[in-house]
């Protein structure tokens, strides 16, 4: 195992190399499980000086019974059987959540000793022939210097002030509810509530992801796994908070829209443009009608100015529009907007933020929607206290600025937030929250107890599966004599038979051959890897075990290194791929240098524009110059000028 830092934000990690084929088979069994015992997925491994004996079950609680996945103008039946929740066997109070894709677990594991995060190794490590496929690190080893950036990952005060004023301009639409509707529905609902004591405590979400988010995570499965882990993370935080007597607030995904890379050119896709400021990005989300949802979020992979990781409209009990359950209405700029919205990004200053930071960002932005402004005052910002005892517990979720995510309070709401949120919940949750219940047949995902799921009769285009409107014993079951249903996976034909052994179910990539159906399951099997050390990513890297994960240096038994300016390197070299002899930094030199000419024949391999350079102090531009991140000139962050071009007029560089 490697005891070195994973990237500039994660101080220490260990590698995991359990058998992925075995876990993949167990996942397939759990998916088809009939017996109670087979429903559990077991994963055992040793890391960080302890044993992890995970017992996980498919998680059906995060997706509503009306759940749909929309992608490129299609509403798909989507199988989320790869999402799991569980615990460490024998460890009380432990909890795990994540996904199993191609036999690899990705997610988080909460233990008595803190939370561990598990991610694919190639997401971080691009310069080793890895003896492991995944990395695991402890929350204490996340050292996130920007935390929430200069403004808590939120926009600065002037942006919120502008938003607050705008929220006051909404025009209420008076809609008359017919009298008989009151009579018919009102008492019935009240009676139902009294008899079952069910409470409206679930906020249903619409999550959209833009093409850049898809580009980073690569597949629909991986995107849904990310959405799931974010929702699970905030669900855990809100469920365990007592909002002045209102308890068990939970979240459920009602609909997902995935914009794939194909949507980048679609003129109807509002998020297609590569460079959109953070306020404009939120506005684009708000211009859609989100009346069917409690909240509507867009997840992206964009590097917004000033270290902003998210933005959301702040809810209020009355007198102002915005936040949970807000309906679409007309505002002062003459546009109809839904202000039950927010956005988050997983990128900051050119790097991807750790999941923990992103989860807290999501909780923070949703906190705004629920009615909490940023924390202020000594009671609610203990991290600013001169008293060391208070200071060491850190600040709460709604703190405006830097939060490391590893202190006791970082995952909790302050009393200030609780007071604000409880007032908004009191007033608004009956407008759109629903009673929490398990997802059922009809949501397009094959779940526990279902053989298939092609949706309701108006959606089901499947000759193989009984739709959700059928009687109890038949719905979500395969029709007699049918082998499979396309809702189970891409290797089932519309004629309800497994596709033949030669049929393609996944395109090939730089490092993996195309996925080919195996003839006996509806799922697309894992792809065969291309040979190790095949060039990839425009010749800057090589394939390792089917992933574009190693540096081109490895092809010649070398290690990648950073040509840093302190080495007296020519500034031009800062954006070259540089190699060194293993464990010998003194030999670090550009691929174009005389030193490595026998390997690269004098050919200089350059980093991709946007890559970090000079030990993360800058990024490479299109001229292959390393631009310092906070230097003046073209990178100046232009404080307080997000999406306000008038302010730019007076800025000289």
């Amino acid at each position: 195992q490697y005891g070195n830092p994973l990237n500039k934000y994660i101080r220490h990690y260990e590698g995991l190399s359990y058998n992925v084929d075995s876990l993949h088979q167990k996942h397939q069994r759990a998916k088809r499980a009939v017996s109670h015992e087979d429903q559990f997925l077991r994963l055992d491994f040793h890391a960080h000086g302890r044993h992890f004996n995970l017992r996980m079950k498919r998680d059906t609680s995060l997706f509503s019974d009306e759940f749909k996945v929309e992608t490129s103008n299609k509403v798909l039946d989507y199988d989320t059987s790869h999402i799991y929740t569980g615990h460490i066997y024998g460890e009380e109070g432990s909890f795990s959540h994540g996904s199993v894709i191609d036999g690899r677990f990705e997610g988080f594991i909460q233990t008595r000793g803190g939370t561990f995060y598990v991610e694919p190794a190639e997401r971080y490590i691009k310069d080793r022939t890895l003896p492991f496929h995944s990395v695991i690190y402890h929350e204490d080893d996340i050292n996130y210097p920007h935390k929430y950036g200069p403004q808590g990952g939120c926009a600065d005060h002037s942006v919120f002030e502008r938003m607050r004023k705008y929220q006051m301009t909404g025009v209420e639409e008076v809609t008359q509810i017919p009298q008989e509707e009151h009579a018919a529905n009102g008492p019935e609902l009240l009676r139902k509530k009294r008899t079952t004591s069910a409470e409206k405590n679930t906020c249903q979400l619409y999550i959209q992801t833009d093409h850049l988010f898809f580009k980073y995570y690569g597949t629909r499965e991986a995107v849904i796994a990310q959405i799931s882990s974010h929702v699970k993370a905030i669900d855990t935080i809100y469920q365990t908070t007592d909002f002045s007597g209102i308890r068990n607030i939970s979240f459920m995904v009602k609909r997902i829209r995935i914009n794939t890379t194909a949507d980048e050119k679609d003129p109807t896709n509002p998020f297609r443009f590569p460079n959109i400021g953070v306020e404009k990005f939120l506005e684009l989300n708000s211009e859609q009608n989100h009346d069917d949802y409690c909240l509507a979020y867009v997840f992206t992979d964009r590097d917004f100015d000033d270290g902003v990781l998210g933005l959301a409209w702040v809810g209020a009990p009355s007198g102002s529009s915005g936040g949970i359950c807000e309906k679409s209405k007309l505002y002062s700029d003459g546009k109809k907007k839904s202000l039950n919205t927010g956005i988050i990004t997983v990128q900051n200053y050119g790097s991807h933020v750790p999941p923990k930071v992103s989860h807290i960002t999501f909780a923070h932005e949703v906190g705004h929607n629920f009615g909490s402004p940023h924390d202020s005052g000594t009671e609610c910002t203990p991290g600013e206290s001169k008293n060391l005892g208070q200071k060491e517990n850190g600040n709460y979720i709604m703190y405006a600025r830097a939060t490391s995510g590893d202190k006791l309070n970082n995952n909790k709401f302050s009393l200030c937030s609780i007071r604000n949120i409880s007032q908004v919940l009191e007033k608004k949750r009956n407008n759109c929250f629903v009673e929490s219940g398990q997802p059922i047949c009809g949501n397009g995902m094959v779940e526990q107890g279902e053989e298939c799921d092609c949706g309701y009769s108006d959606q089901c285009k499947d000759e193989c599966c009984f739709d959700a409107n059928q009687p109890e014993g038949r719905k979500c079951k395969l029709k007699p004599g049918k082998q499979c249903s396309p809702s189970q996976g891409p290797c089932c034909t519309a004629q309800c038979a497994f596709k033949s052994k030669s049929e393609k179910c996944r395109d090939d990539s730089d490092c993996a051959r195309e996925g080919i159906c195996n003839g006996f399951t509806a799922l697309c099997p894992a792809s065969d890897p291309k040979p190790n050390f095949t060039d990839c990513n425009r010749h800057t890297q090589v394939c390792i075990n089917g992933q574009c994960a190693g540096s081109i240096c490895e092809k010649y038994g070398l290690e990648e290194c950073t040509c840093a300016s302190s080495d007296g390197k020519d500034d031009k070299e800062l954006c070259h791929v540089c190699c060194m002899k293993k464990m010998d930094p003194s030999t670090c030199a550009s691929t174009g240098s005389v030193q490595w000419s026998r390997h690269f024949s004098g050919r200089t391999i350059t980093l991709q524009p946007g890559s970090p350079c000079n030990d993360f102090r800058g990024y490479c531009d299109v001229f292959m110059r390393c631009r310092l991140v906070d230097a003046d000139g073209p990178l100046a962050r232009l404080k307080k000028a997000i999406f306000s071009p008038e302010l730019y007029e007076n800025i000289a560089e």
Partner: nanobody, 123 residues
Framework: EMQLVESGGGLVQTGGSLRLSCAAS????????VGWWRQAPGKERDVVAA????????DYVDSVKGRFTISRDNAENTVYLQMNSLKPEDTAVYYC????????????????WGQGTQVTVSS
Amino acid sequence: EMQLVESGGGLVQTGGSLRLSCAASGRTFTSYCVGWWRQAPGKERDVVAAITRGSNSTDYVDSVKGRFTISRDNAENTVYLQMNSLKPEDTAVYYCAADINCRNLYTGRPEYWGQGTQVTVSS
């Protein structure tokens, strides 16, 4: 929405000169970093030169240094590319690009692009 219109392209002999113009609509042009890219037949679009908002920083790709000069006139909402000592390998469609976030321009992902103007250098 910003619109960029290039002009000034044409056919020229080796060693000759051309001056390309990029006219921008929108009164906030001064807020944008602007660059010139070119695309030769069958090749990828590559950067040529770029200029910051205040004109105090210009960049050129090695192959045009000393021959091409980028400049801007904010009063006229125009950016120029003066091309001297032209060579056959300079033959390409030249595009103007701009972005309010300079970082996007400098990492090759500008938001706004013009339609391009053809430059042909004959030997």
